[in-house]
Interface confidence: medium
């Protein structure tokens, strides 16, 4: 048994059988490909508040600091995604590392990532139901960036 | 014919046949799921110099501006990846948008992304040889971030 990918799952089901609706071994092995956060989740260096550290991972040293939030869905590939959550509305001053500078905004950088969802195949029922993968675009925030505010024309 | 995914391709080949080594239709459809850059590639606003714009996409308004470089591999899913290339060694001043501030470094944020490579199946030869997908971690730079320089203990 192997996983099969299909663009339009409900229209052209290309599926894999499963035992009593449990995900097959291949699904578990493949879907557990978690997307770890770009910076390691550090318990010693998580940004406690709106400040830019002088050591630790990139997300806490940034003047637009952020932390990562886990988004786990066992029916999705990858199962684990991490969203960047900005810790400050404005950028932190490079001088002090703590005071905010109203000249700069701290904003998330979004990305539409391709993910796959495990769905029951269209028209399939019963205990030996088959599953297929449905491709979707999923919006994630990758990081927070210090930008100059947009000037409206 | 449908695509099949395998964790360890060479050890447990789970493959799909191809016509004279041409990728099957499903491969082309699925692999063309390109990962577009988080910010749209704008010809009017691409930040190709070390300055922070007051309009345009996020990567040109950032005080750690970057441009995107296309990385295309037709035997990979996704076929298209974009790497952020920092345009300044230091962060740009929020005041002027052009002068660099030596108190801040502009550094790339790296991420190990899961990709899949189309490989000939182990032990398969001839004109009707089959292909399988091999999962790999691939290092991409997502964006450039303005950070306070690391203080060595």
């Amino acid at each position: 048994v192997s996983l099969r990918i299909q663009e339009g799952c409900s229209h052209l089901p290309s599926c894999c059988p499963s035992k009593e609706q449990e995900p097959p071994e291949e699904w578990l092995k493949w879907s557990s490909a978690s997307v770890s956060p770009p910076e390691p989740l550090s318990h010693t260096h998580h940004a406690e508040s709106c400040r830019a550290s002088k050591d630790g991972p990139l997300n806490s040293r940034a003047i637009s600091p952020w932390s990562y939030e886990l988004d786990r869905d066992l029916n999705r590939v990858p199962q684990d995604l991490y969203h960047a959550r900005c810790l400050c509305p404005h950028c932190v001053s490079l001088q002090t590392g703590s005071h905010m500078d109203p000249l700069g905004n701290s904003v998330p950088l979004y990305h539409n990532q391709t993910v796959f969802y495990r769905r029951p195949c269209h028209g399939e029922e019963g205990t030996h139901r088959r599953y297929c993968l449905e491709r979707r675009l999923y919006r994630v925030s990758l990081a927070c960036v210090c930008v100059r505010p947009r000037v409206m024309a | 014919v449908s695509l099949r995914i395998q964790e360890g391709c060479s050890h447990l080949p789970s493959c799909c046949p191809s016509k004279e080594q041409e990728p099957p239709e499903e491969w082309l459809k699925w692999s063309s799921a390109s990962v577009s850059p988080p910010e749209p590639l704008s010809h009017t606003h691409h930040a190709e110099s070390c300055r922070a714009s007051k309009d345009g996409p996020l990567n040109s308004r950032a005080i750690s501006p970057w441009s995107y470089e296309l990385d295309r591999d037709l035997n990979r899913v996704p076929q298209d990846l974009y790497h952020a290339r920092c345009l300044c060694p230091h962060c740009v001043s929020l005041q002027t948008g052009s002068h660099m501030d030596p108190l801040g470094n502009s550094v790339p944020l790296y991420h190990n992304q899961t990709v899949f490579y189309r490989r000939p199946c182990h032990g398969e030869e001839g004109t009707h040889r089959r292909y399988c997908l091999e999962r790999r971690l691939y290092r991409v730079s997502l964006a450039c971030v303005c950070v306070r320089p690391r203080v060595m203990a």
């Epitope: 989740l41 318990h43 998580h46 940004a47 406690e48 508040s49 932390s67 939030e69 886990l70 988004d71 786990r72 869905d73 029916n75 969203h83 959550r85 900005c86 810790l87 904003v107 998330p108 999923y138 919006r139 925030s141 | -």
Partner: antibody, heavy 121, light 108 residues
Amino acid sequence: QVTLKESGPGILQPSQTLSLTCSFSGFSLSTSGMGVSWIRQPSGKGLEWLAHIYWDDAKFYNPSLKSRVTISKDTSRNQVFLRITSVDTADIATYYCARRGYDNYGGFVDWGQGTLVTVSS
Amino acid sequence: ENVLIQSPAIMSASLGEKVTMSCRASSSVNYMYWYQQKSDAPPKLWIYYTSNLAPGVPGRFSGSGSGNSYSLTISSMEGEDAATYYCQQFTSYPYMYTFGGGTKLEIK
């Protein structure tokens, strides 16, 4: 087993400050990813989110109430607090605290029973 | 700010009948959450990540949808399903949890 329990004054007068406490057990607000929100519900009406606080002390507020609301926590005592200044009759509601799951991105897994707040002169 | 519109506001169904209620978002969202609330009780998480049933939720419930349009379905109405159901979504920027106005489900 996770439990949350809200407590407050019950009744207060217009223009006073409302102070509520959420006491919880079964989880720690020092755990990475953990967060608690305050949500209110006027009698017979829908739910309105007020504020959220994270393990890392990041705080977020409903923009419509931001100027009047403050959320805080005491991690060692397993408590989260909410203050609303200058209350009036529009603030009459049942106030709930709720825990957002560590891996349940954006959903509230556990709720307290709620505490009724009345504003009367 | 994303607005969630639930419809219908009130509905009634006979025992054994199939029930579907909807939730429309003014902006596209990744996921929808559903809560069940009975009188004088707090809401209970009922469906998370659009289609996953919370522990203890009967299998006759299901959730579906994507983008702006989501729905909760009961394949065969039972007496204990009479309650108010709220949809809810989360956006991280601007940071906001939003609830729909609710659908009150009664027994016919």
